[in-house]
Structures are given as structure tokens and as C-alpha cells.
């Protein structure tokens, strides 16, 4: 029995005064705890516990299951113990068949003996199979058999505790060892989507998938720069012995603008940690933003092609798109497609293909798009560059020579006089009057220019050239003069195209 210095509280004393007691099945167990501050007896075996507030513990007919550690505790929290073996030839082992070991750690096969005097207390494989060569164990009759440094390869190993009794081997019930793997890498985490765009009131739900060798991995959703605990829901599975998957789903049933931000799924195990983020943007209503991919003022040469291209952001998804010209909607010649196939894509492209444009096809081309919340539009002003065309060239009654030309950009008209039979007209003539006329056609059409010169200035036979030109090309008209006496006659004008 323990002894302590006078004045200090001492542990209780137990009778019989020995650390171990062996009784036979059916015999009485009588244990007396002596202490002025007695509190209780506690009995422990395997994971079971029992208490007794009497200072004398009496079991009239002992059974094998009464084998275990009896501890008496006093009011100072000091205690003393005795271990009782109840020898029962028919029940040599007490067992708790749940057997779980952590990789690289020791684990206890819980098969304590009811008789400490049996021999060769050890482990054996089931159905006569040998144990793994590297499996080492240490027997302890009061606790069981400790397997040292559990290996992952021992998972699902079937074994028995074994003793020799009267020359025969006796086996316990079978145990199946389940090995909890040690973490030798960080968890693998992924998120269902990297970004979310929602309108106020819509549900935000995002799922984080955590993969690891066992479910002991810790995971949580966190809001960046916030300590608030987020509500999450779990689903999990073991796909194989060391292949665990958890899905942690975070939900905000009615998202608000101030819920916008970065959410992190964080996972860690004893090896290390990993995280992945998703961004939530909540807008009060939907939107459409259009970005022209070319200048909205377009110049194109007569007969050439042009593509009017826009990119636009639309949230929610666009519902109606159209291209319009002169109040008419295009049914073909255009295409509309998402910029990417990404699930969270909000960017789209629309292209109108105008082919072999005529001078009469200039004007405003409008792209319109709408979704459930908003409409948006963008206009392109298309100008078709055309070579000047001389509309009229006449000698007026007042003796003026007049030339009217149309084209885009606005043509310039120059006048030249060629004396006699010379082919090249080089002497320029200044016009008396130049006017830009309003075209009766649509806006963006050809511009009409009228230029006049005084024919009285010409005293000799020859040719007058009216030359209309712009960036695209030039066209000329000619007036031929012949003098008969004092009379000047205009011989039929004619035009020549000069490329």
C-alpha cells in the first residue's frame, strides 16, 4: 500500500492489498476501500465503465466479464487500483472486436485475458494464414495485444488473439483491422465554378470538392476578411479504401449586393493545407454592355465587303438580338454566338456580314439586344465610297457651262481647256460658281456637286474638260467648241472615263 508524508492527503487503501487478484468463475469478489473521504469505486474493462458509491464492492458470483480494473477514488481525487482476473476456462478472452489502427502508429487488439497464467499469448492470422512478416506485437494480459507501427498494407487484415491452454491453442473471435491512413500529401480541393454573377434575390450555391485518403480531413468554407461561420452542407463518400471525397456546399438562399466577395474553401490535414476560391458578384439588376469591335463610323468602297462586329456583356442571358437597317430587320447575313463555352460566360459576339455594298446601301446599321431586365443598342454609320458620276453637263442659255457630279466622298470638279486638237487638256479654268447640292436620296448617300464656268472666255476652237474626282476615282465630260464666223457652237458633249 502507498505511503505518504504526514499532513498530505493520501490515496485510499484497498483490501486485499495487492495489485492483481485472481478469482475463479462463480466465486465471490469482495473489495474494500478504506478512506475517510471515500467517494466511489469505478470498474473499467475495454470501453465499459461502472460505478459504485459503496466502499465495499461485492460481486457474489463472479463472471469472466467482471475481469478488469477496479479503482477507488477519494474526495481529494487520489485513487488506488486493483486488477481482478476472473478465470473462466470457457471464456479466456474478453473482446471488443472493433479494431482500428492509424498508419505508422501502434494499435491495441482489445482481447484482455481472464487468466494471466495461460501461455503463448499472441496474434494469429485467420484460417491459418500467416501474419505479415513485418508485423510486430507486444502482448499485455490486462489490455490486449499492441500491434506496433501499423502499415497501410495491414488494412482489412483478419486475425485472432491466441493462447495455449493445457497444450492446446485457443483462439479468440476474429478481428478485422481497419487502417486509417496517415496523410502524406495535402488535400486536393476544387470548386464547382470560379466565379458567379447573380441578381439580388437569386440563390447562390457553390460546391467545394475535397479529396483525401481519409475522412479525417478538415474542411470549411470561409468568407475572405470575415470570421463569420458559414452554413454548409456535406455529402461524402469513400470510393475505395484510401480514396475519400467530400462535397461541401455553401448556399445563400437570397443573395444581396453586399454578399459580393471572395469565398474560400479551405481544407487541411496533418500534412498541410490547400484552398480554392470562388468570386460572387451580386448586381441589383441585370445589364447589357456593348463594345464595338470596329469604329462605329465605317467607310467602305463600292462593291467591297464589310463586317460589323460587336462584343457585348449580357446578364442574364440575352433573349433577343437583331440587326436593323432602314427600319428593316436582317433575317440572315448575321450570326450571334457566346465568346466562350465557359458555363459562367456572359460575353457574346454578334457579326453582320455586308457583301458587295452598293452606293445606295450606306446608312445607319443598328444592333439591338435585350434580356429580361434591359435593352441596349449600338449604331454603325456606314459610308460607301463611290467614284464620281457626272449627272449632267450642259451649256446653259446664259452661256455658262455647267457640270453636276455625284459621289462619295464629295467630288471635286476641275475644268480644263484644250485648244485645237491637243489631246491633253492642261490649262485649268477657274469655275465661276461651285455649289454642293442636297441629295434627294438617303443620308450617307452620294454627295452632289455643281460647278459652272463662263464659256465666253473661250476664243478658239477646242475642248473643255469637266473632271470630277475623289479618293475613289475620276470621271470626265467634254465640251467641243467650233467657231463659224462670230458664232460659237457647242458640239455634243461626251464623257470619257479616266481610271
Amino acid at each position: 500500500q502507498p505511503s505518504v508524508s504526514p499532513g498530505e492527503p493520501s490515496p485510499p487503501s484497498i483490501h486485499p492489498g495487492k495489485s492483481d487478484l485472481i478469482v475463479r468463475v462463480g466465486d465471490e469478489i469482495r473489495l474494500l476501500c478504506t478512506d475517510p473521504g471515500f467517494v466511489k469505486w469505478t470498474f473499467e474493462i475495454l470501453d465499459e465503465t461502472n460505478e459504485n458509491k459503496q466502499n465495499e464492492w461485492i460481486t457474489e458470483k463472479a463472471e469472466a466479464t467482471n475481469t478488469g480494473k477496479y479503482t477507488c477514488t477519494n474526495k481529494h481525487g487520489l485513487s488506488n487500483s486493483i486488477y481482478v482476473f476472473v478465470r473462466d476456462p470457457a471464456k479466456l478472452f474478453l473482446v471488443d472486436r472493433s479494431l482500428y489502427g492509424k498508419e505508422d502508429n501502434d494499435t491495441l487488439v482489445r482481447c484482455p485475458l481472464t487468466d494471466p497464467e495461460v501461455t503463448n499469448y499472441s496474434l494469429k492470422g485467420c484460417q491459418g494464414k500467416p501474419l505479415p512478416k513485418d508485423l510486430r506485437f507486444i502482448p499485455d494480459p490486462k489490455a490486449g495485444i499492441m500491434i506496433k507501427s501499423v502499415k497501410r498494407a495491414y488494412h482489412r487484415l483478419c486475425l485472432h488473439c491466441s493462447v495455449d491452454q493445457e497444450g492446446k491453442s485457443v483462439l479468440s473471435e476474429k478481428f478485422i483491422l481497419k487502417v486509417r491512413p496517415a496523410f502524406k500529401a495535402v488535400p486536393v480541393v476544387s470548386v464547382s465554378k470560379a466565379s458567379y454573377l447573380l441578381r439580388e434575390g437569386e440563390e447562390f450555391t457553390v460546391t467545394c470538392t475535397i479529396k483525401d485518403v481519409s475522412s479525417s480531413v478538415y474542411s470549411t468554407w470561409k468568407r475572405e476578411n470575415s470570421q463569420t461561420k458559414l452554413q454548409e452542407k456535406y455529402n461524402s463518400w469513400h470510393h475505395g479504401d484510401f480514396n475519400y471525397e467530400r462535397q461541401a456546399t455553401l448556399t445563400i438562399s437570397s443573395a444581396r449586393v453586399n454578399d459580393s466577395g471572395v469565398f474560400m474553401c479551405y481544407a487541411n490535414n496533418t500534412f498541410g493545407s490547400a484552398n480554392v476560391t470562388t468570386t460572387l458578384e451580386v448586381v441589383d439588376k441585370g445589364f447589357i454592355n456593348i463594345f464595338p469591335m470596329i469604329n462605329t463610323t465605317v467607310f467602305v468602297n463600292d462593291g467591297e465587303n464589310v463586317d460589323l462586329i460587336v462584343e457585348y456583356e449580357a446578364f442574364p442571358k440575352p433573349e433577343h438580338q437583331q440587326w436593323i437597317y432602314m427600319n428593316r430587320t436582317f433575317t440572315d447575313k448575321w450570326e450571334d454566338y457566346p465568346k466562350s463555352e465557359n458555363e459562367s460566360n456572359i460575353r457574346y459576339v454578334s457579326e453582320l456580314h455586308l457583301t458587295r455594298l452598293k452606293g445606295t446601301e450606306g446608312g445607319t446599321y443598328t444592333f439591338l439586344v435585350s434580356n429580361s431586365d434591359v435593352n441596349a443598342a449600338i449604331a454603325f454609320n456606314v459610308y460607301v465610297n463611290t467614284k464620281p458620276e457626272i449627272l449632267t453637263y450642259d451649256r446653259l442659255v446664259n452661256g455658262m457651262l455647267q457640270c453636276v457630279a455625284a459621289g462619295f466622298p464629295e467630288p471635286t470638279i476641275d475644268w480644263y481647256f484644250c485648244p485645237g486638237t491637243e489631246q491633253r487638256c492642261s490649262a485649268s479654268v477657274l469655275p465661276v460658281d461651285v455649289q454642293t447640292l442636297n441629295s434627294s436620296g438617303p443620308p450617307f448617300g452620294k454627295l452632289v456637286v455643281q460647278s459652272s464656268i463662263d464659256s465666253s472666255a473661250f476664243k478658239h476652237n477646242g475642248t473643255v474638260e469637266c473632271k470630277a474626282y475623289n479618293d475613289v476615282g475620276k470621271t470626265s465630260a467634254y465640251f467641243n467648241f467650233a467657231f463659224k464666223g462670230n458664232n460659237k457652237e457647242q458640239i455634243h458633249p461626251h464623257t470619257l472615263f479616266t481610271p
Partner: antibody, heavy 123, light 107 residues
């Protein structure tokens, strides 16, 4: 003897709150997860949630999350299931049960069951 | 969620009959399966854990087998006290789920 003892039957009105208990004895309470299982009249068993009394780590069936709260007081070896606002559809027998020592803590089967607490919600 | 489908939902048998109940999971659950017996007005009782291990104190006429997705509970010789409802339960992952139950009645 290893056992779980649950609190007695309850009759409540819709909208009322309730907390039922489950006291473990005969074993080390913090070594085992405690689960709660619902059985509606004439129906099968439905797992609701579990708790690790050692650190109060909890797992809920998604359909029960936010509807009920589980907790544990390891100092008195007791687990609890509570409602803040009962509905008629909460009428059922509720069992607490101990998870056998699964190697991840909760993957074993339920080896010890309480006797059940009948909750009746009626106006 | 992992769905557990039990069949049949009920059966009639006589004392001494061999009875087999099957349970199928919607995905592989290794051998993480338990079988329970429930009598009217009583709490369920664990019979088999880890698909094939007999719980301490349960008569040896009960046995379990299977792994992956298909599992079987067999009562080799039905006794009067075995008339009850039997449930399977997967313990592979969350949420834990039970089969719908098989009621074994007297023929």
C-alpha cells in the same frame, strides 16, 4: 451495462420549442459519436445528424440542417436534439444511437440505441 | 445521397424457413453496411456490422454477406422471435442512409 437513456415523451403545439436528451452510461462517452434517427409513424428509419461529444463536431443531413440543432455536454455524458419552432410534421419517434468505433469516428454502424422519445406536435 | 434499396419490402415465412433479404446501394460502399432488426414499439437492434460481422450476442443463424453495391442478410432457420422489420444502413459517407425496410411476417 452500456446504455443510452432518452428523456420522456413530449406533446407540444406547433411553433413551440423543444429539447430532448440522451444520456450515455457504462462506457466512455467521449469515445463515440452519437447519432439521431427519426422514425415517423408507420415509416422507416431516417438518419438526421451526428455529434462527436469530445469536440462537438457535427454533421447534419442536408434536409435537417437549420431545422434542428444537436449538441452535447460531455461533463454529464448527454447529447441533445432541439427544435426552435415545431411543426406538425415533426411528429415522430426520435432515437439516439451510438456509433460503433468507426476508424474515422463515425463510419461504424449504430451499436447501442436509446429507447426512443415520442414527440407529438398537434394544435 | 447514397440510395439504399431493400427487397422485398415484405415477406411471409414459416418458422424454420431460410430467409434472405437483399440491399443494394446506388454506388459502391465497400463493406460499410449494417443490418438492424426492429420489433414493434422497440428501438432497432444491430445484428451485423461491416457487412458480414455478427454483433456480439446475436444468434449465429443471422449472417451477412456482400461488398460494393450488393448485400444480403440471411436467417438460416427462422425462429418465432425473428418476426420483425429489418433495415440495412450504409456507413460509407454522409448523409448516412437506411434502406426502406423489409417486414418479415408469419405465413
Amino acid at each position: 451495462e452500456v446504455q443510452l437513456v432518452q428523456s420522456g415523451a413530449e406533446v407540444k403545439k406547433p411553433g413551440e420549442s423543444l429539447k430532448i436528451s440522451c444520456k450515455g452510461s457504462g462506457y466512455s462517452f467521449t469515445n463515440y459519436w452519437i447519432g439521431w434517427v427519426r422514425q415517423m409513424p408507420g415509416k422507416g428509419l431516417e438518419w438526421m445528424a451526428i455529434i462527436n461529444p469530445r469536440d462537438s463536431d457535427t454533421r447534419y443531413r442536408p434536409s435537417f440542417q437549420g431545422q434542428v440543432t444537436i449538441s452535447a455536454d460531455k461533463s454529464i455524458s448527454t447529447a441533445y436534439l432541439q427544435w426552435s419552432s415545431l411543426k406538425a410534421s415533426d411528429t415522430a419517434m426520435y432515437y439516439c444511437a451510438r456509433h460503433g468505433r468507426g476508424y474515422e469516428g463515425y463510419e461504424g454502424a449504430f451499436d447501442i440505441w436509446g429507447q426512443g422519445t415520442l414527440v407529438t406536435v398537434s394544435s | 445521397d447514397i440510395q439504399m434499396t431493400q427487397s422485398p419490402s415484405s415477406l411471409s415465412a414459416s418458422v424454420g424457413d431460410r430467409v434472405t433479404i437483399t440491399c443494394r446501394s446506388s454506388q459502391g460502399i465497400r463493406s460499410d453496411l449494417g443490418w438492424y432488426q426492429q420489433k414493434p414499439g422497440k428501438a432497432p437492434k444491430l445484428l451485423i456490422y461491416d457487412a458480414s460481422n455478427l454483433e456480439t450476442g446475436v444468434p449465429s443463424r443471422f449472417s451477412g454477406s456482400g461488398s460494393g453495391t450488393d448485400f444480403t442478410l440471411t436467417i438460416s432457420s427462422l425462429q418465432p422471435e425473428d418476426f420483425a422489420t429489418y433495415y440495412c444502413q450504409q456507413a460509407n459517407g454522409f448523409p448516412l442512409t437506411f434502406g426502406g425496410g423489409t417486414k418479415v411476417e408469419i405465413k
